[in-house]
Amino acid sequence: GSVKVLHEPSCFSDYISTSVCQWKMDHPTNCSAELRLSYQLDFMGSENHTCVPENREDSVCVCSMPIDDAVEADVYQLDLWAGQQLLWSGSFQPSKHVKPRTPGNLTVHPNISHTWLLMWTNPYPTENHLHSELTYMVNVSNDNDPEDFKVYNVTYMGPTLRLAASTLKSGASYSARVRAWAQTYNSTWSDWSPSTTWLNYYEPWEQHLGLNDIFEAQKIEWHEHHHHHHHH
């Protein structure tokens, strides 16, 4: 039977080492057995390279192509093949289709003045174009109350966010995740980072205490409680 593409390839680049193309076939397909995506940089002397696609769903194929450190002028010629049959041909300019890497190592630390300090890592090395271009969105949500969530836009350089404990419900468990985008490249958002979860302790009467004092008090309370049970 004839092989047809239902939704033609859509490609994004992390603008450092990888471009990913995804497309949908008109029927369930064993992508790696039946299809090949060839790609070639439009540059003198460039060789043709082949990507073996994998299945994302029954009829959805995805191909991850290693690319050299991308620059704005790079344009790739893409050809999708089923054996000797050319199913689709197009071009792809990574700088015009950027999807940043996911921010990493999201952590939450108690900070002075009743604040939580959220920190994560910029996914790009300092020498990469995108390192200084990223802005972030942080999503903070109550694990037990879907209505209780906040979205913070971090438009300054540092990958940090200070969060007043008083803005969150006391005693509630919260999760945070972060994603990135590059405004000057008109990029899409990155995938969300894995969530990190913490327990928010904040009571009005504790306002004279720093959060570190509260944590020390909690540690003592826990220790005494544990010690008490150990003796009975």
Partner: antibody, heavy 125, light 112 residues
């Protein structure tokens, strides 16, 4: 040590054919593009052709397009230039040269970083 | 096609002085920041050419630091400082960005 040794230059009549060879050693031949460049007596350098490391991509100057064919045998570390329909103006010293590294996605460029000693082609009746 | 134009076509310099050769292309040779596909070659009488500078400003292996390349876009310069007798020869610029590759006409450097 990188070495490029051209051969095949000769005296040939107009309309005739000739095949030049360039044997390479001292570097991973299959990873690099190779070029042919010529120099007519008392004149400057003229680029003729480039072939990618795998041999899959070839490029030509307008002056030789359709008459000259560049090729390579990576098993023999040898570059070739097949020259047909030769003309008096093709008289020159022909050099082979090592060009960009093409095994990477974007070729890494170092200029024409090594040249052969040249072989003389004379086209005359 | 990209046309390469060198100036001057000949140059006479005393030992110890600085020689400067200009090369202009009909199109920009900048592919991206830091990637200017312009080379400089030297050819001594009766010898094969040898690479001096690639990507506009990078010295080829074994080349003296008296040779320096600069420029971007369509304007490039080769400077030879503290010129020596052994520097005599013909100097060529070449664009390596797109087919057909092309050389300048050459600049003959004579040492007084």
């Amino acid at each position: 040590e990188v070495q490029l040794v051209e051969s095949g230059g000769d005296l040939v009549k107009p309309g005739g054919s000739l095949r030049l060879s360039c044997v390479a050693s001292g570097f991973p031949f299959r990873d690099y593009a190779m070029d042919w460049v010529r120099q007519a007596p008392g004149k400057g350098l003229q680029w003729l052709s480039l072939i990618s490391g795998s041999g899959g991509k070839t490029y030509y100057a307008d002056a030789v397009k359709g008459r000259f064919t560049i090729s390579r045998d990576n098993a023999k570390n040898t570059l070739y230039l097949q020259m047909n329909s030769l003309r008096a103006e093709d008289t020159a010293v022909y050099y082979c040269a090592v060009d960009r590294l093409t095994k990477t996605i974007r070729p890494q460029y170092y200029g024409l970083w090594s040249w052969g000693q040249g072989t003389l082609v004379t086209v005359s009746s | 096609d990209i046309v390469m134009t060198q100036t001057p076509l000949s140059l006479s310099v005393s030992p110890g002085e600085t020689a400067s050769i200009s090369c202009r292309s009909s199109q920009s040779l900048t592919y991206s920041i830091g990637y200017n596909y312009l080379d400089w070659y030297m050819q001594k009488p009766g010898q094969s050419p040898q690479g001096l500078i690639y990507l506009g400003s990078k010295r080829a292996s074994g080349v003296s630091d008296r040779f320096s390349g600069s420029g971007s876009g369509a304007d490039f310069t080769l400077k030879i400082s503290r010129v020596e007798a052994d520097d005599a020869g013909v100097y060529y610029c070449m664009q390596g960005l797109q087919s057909p590759l092309g050389f300048g006409q050459g600049t003959k450097l004579e040492i007084k």
